[in-house]
Interface confidence: medium
């Protein structure tokens, strides 16, 4: 079991300057550690590649929405 | 360098049917997401169709005013993208244009054809 | 589907600053996509993402987009600018929206 209170802090350093459709994305999770040099999103693909991007942009935006979206929506 | 040719246009009979093309080259053809964009006499750029990518399965979109008539298909052997126009109207005289893009569903269009131009008329 | 609304024609001298305007409802919250097409040639592609410029298309060509309302400005324009301009934004499904064009004259 990992110690909550050590346990490493994943930060994104730089940001991906391009698009992700959508439809490639299978997740994705929110950094706002104050350990990190600035809050970001990290995306996880549906070939499990993570890729940092900025929450400011509205790809990114777009793409939380849709990701949000298909949880509340399971596929039948 | 990309390029989207078009063919297939011409005169047709109200109610009648027309298959256009439109031949790629230039790029990864099934990486992109393609659509049709027609652009009547004197009129504004109005979306027809698109195509998605391989990354969705080639998911399709139409329209309100062609859903049902038109079907738009891509053969990724041929780098080709197809419109089957069926049951046409007077108000589909237009110049067809194929373009591609990129990322969904930030749809844009960064390279376009030369187009092709529909006349249906009796 | 978002409805987007341009201003039918827009005239400029040489030399100044074109503004076209292209409305909608939250626009700002989306990508806007500005086109131009000159007479018998198919649309070009000027700005993408509210406010870049694709590799080939002139600085004096710049775009931004909140609240209601997306601009295309051209600084200094030039005869060769006389087109029809259409704005472009998106909704679901990779279908597009188009605005109604507006017609920029070079006096």
């Known amino acids: 079991q990992p110690d909550a209170i050590n346990a490493p802090v994943t930060c994104c350093y730089n940001f991906t300057n391009r698009k992700i459709s959508v439809q490639r994305l299978a997740s994705y999770r929110r950094i706002t550690s104050s350990k990190c040099p600035k809050e970001a999103v990290i995306f996880k693909t549906i070939v499990a590649k993570e890729i940092c991007a900025d929450p400011k942009q509205k790809w990114v935006q777009d793409s939380m929405d849709h990701l949000d979206k298909q949880i509340q929506t399971p596929k039948p | 360098q990309v390029q989207l040719v078009e063919s297939g246009g011409g005169l047709v009979q109200p109610g009648g049917s027309l298959r256009l093309s439109c031949a790629a080259s230039g790029f990864t053809f099934r990486s992109y997401g393609m659509s049709w964009v027609r652009q009547a006499p004197g009129k504004g750029l109005e979306w027809v169709s698109s195509i998605e990518h391989k990354w969705t399965n080639y998911a399709t979109s139409y329209a309100a005013s062609v859903k049902g008539r038109f079907t738009i298909s891509r053969d990724n052997s041929k780098n080709t993208l197809y419109l089957q126009m069926n049951s046409l109207r007077a108000e589909d005289t237009a110049v067809y244009y194929c373009?591609?893009?990129?990322?969904?569903?930030?749809?844009?269009?960064?390279?376009w054809g030369q187009g092709t131009l529909v006349t249906v008329s009796s | 589907d978002i409805e987007l609304t341009q201003p039918p024609s827009v005239s400029v001298a040489p030399g100044q600053t074109a503004r076209i305007s292209c409305s909608g409802d939250?626009?700002?919250?989306?990508?806007v996509y500005w086109y131009q097409q000159k007479p018998g040639q198919a649309p070009v592609l000027v700005i993408y993402d509210d406010d870049n410029r694709p590799s080939g298309i002139p600085e004096r060509f710049s775009g931004s987009n909140s609240g209601n309302t997306a601009t295309l400005t051209i600084s200094g324009t030039q005869a060769e600018d006389e087109a029809d301009y259409y704005c472009?934004?998106?909704?679901?499904?990779?279908?597009?929206?188009f605005g109604g064009g507006t017609k920029l004259t070079v006096l």
């Open positions: 373009a591609r893009f990129e990322f969904t569903p930030w749809t844009y269009f960064d390279f």
């Open positions: 939250n626009l700002g919250k989306k990508y």
């Open positions: 472009q934004s998106y909704t679901a499904q990779s279908s597009a929206s």
